[in-house]
Amino acid sequence: FKVTTPYSLYVCPEGQNATLTCRILGPVSKGHDVTIYKTWYLSSRGEVQMCSERRPIRNLTFQDLHLHHGGHQAANTSHDLAQRHGLELASDHHGNFSITLRNVTPRDSGLYCCLVIELKNHHPEQRFYGSMELQVQAGKGSGSTCMASNEQDSDSITAA
């Protein structure tokens, strides 16, 4: 399988909720010996290797933001720690998984990375990355919503 990002750029007015999404495409290994771990972190745009630097999201590290399961099982956590920081993690049966940042501020702007680790008994682990940029516009009216797009094209969609 591989990890894709439906949108590479999210532009949100301050105060909105931003839901950033990654998607596992292709067949996920099935079987009793397969475990999938998913997590999120902030990184830097100017790196040779994207997503190699790992910075916390609202003071929560990628180890705090692990979602964990076998295959395409759904998982959803409203862990106290994440909730208190205005974050929510979700994952569905179709390979989509997301992080929601509530009430975004310009300080939330940056390059967000999702990491998927596939562990199989007696196999080396496999790691897949996705990245997307969040731009939070200061002082914009609370009536407007987040816009998600791919930077290379002009199509955009209103995001949650």
Epitope: Q63, D64, H68, S78, H79, D80, L81
Partner: antibody
Framework: QVQLQQSGAELVRPGVSVKISCKGS????????MHWVKQSHAKSLEWIGL????????TYNHKFKGKATMTVDKSSRTAYMELARLTSEDSAIYYC??????????WGQGTSVTASS | NIAMTQTPKFLLVSAGDRVTITCKAS??????IAWYQQKPGQSPRLLIY???NRYTGVPDRFTGSGYGTDFTFTISTVQAEDLAVYFC?????????FGGGTKLEIK
């Protein structure tokens, strides 16, 4: 194959300190936090704390603050826990357990610590 | 601290029986509950996470359910090798806490 290999049993005099280790193999050590758990007959399982193996930050159960100190050595893929000023109350089996999501998915074999004169 | 009250403490059952263990949290823990099995002389082993997800390699006779404060762990058809102590654990907030354990014995 993911494994957590803990150091051997410790029999020590009351009042001294002991440092036990937990070496991770078969996975990227710094991708997962490490929990420490105490198991005694009296108290079943008690969570001591959690260390972030990437940043080195530790979160303690307030009950074990001043008693346990967790550290990590990334280069040797090893987590450590030092127990200070041992008393008979500290005699127990101590486990390290890998943090994954909201669970502890792999556990070490346990280290027995006995404080006795 | 969130207290996890696990019942019963002991279960004596026959192979083939259905077994249910309950865990009650002193406040809501959402679905941040895991269940572990500890066989005699061994380390605990993860069976269920996020309250109802079966961990890799765990037989489907083990199931978990619940949300908020009330959680249930079920073994649909007990087998001789299920002799063990079973623990629930909340990971919703620190300090993480465990139930007192349920010792399952086979007649």
């Amino acid at each position: 194959q993911v494994q957590l290999q803990q150091s051997g049993a410790e029999l020590v005099r009351p009042g001294v300190s002991v440092k036990i280790s937990c070496k991770g193999s078969g996975y990227t050590f710094t991708d997962y936090g490490m929990h420490w758990v105490k198991q005694s007959h009296a108290k079943s399982l008690e969570w001591i704390g959690l260390i972030d193996t990437y940043y080195g930050d530790a979160t303690y159960n307030h009950k074990f603050k001043g008693k346990a100190t967790m550290t990590v050595d990334k280069s040797s893929r090893t987590a450590y826990m030092e127990l200070a000023r041992l008393t008979s109350e500290d005699s127990a089996i101590y486990y390290c357990a890998r943090r994954a999501g909201n669970a502890m998915d792999y556990w070490g074999q346990g280290t027995s610590v006995t404080a006795s004169s | 601290n969130i207290a996890m009250t696990q019942t019963p403490k002991f279960l004596l059952v026959s192979a083939g029986d259905r077994v249910t263990i309950t865990c009650k949290a002193s406040q809501s823990v959402s679905n941040d509950i895991a269940w572990y099995q500890q066989k005699p002389g061994q380390s605990p082993r993860l069976l269920i996470y996020y309250a109802s997800n079966r961990y890799t390699g765990v037989p489907d006779r083990f199931t978990g359910s619940g949300y908020g404060t009330d959680f249930t762990f079920t073994i649909s058809t007990v087998q001789a090798e299920d002799l063990a102590v079973y623990f629930c654990q909340q990971d919703y907030s620190s300090p993480r806490t465990f139930g007192g354990g349920t010792k399952l014995e086979i007649k």
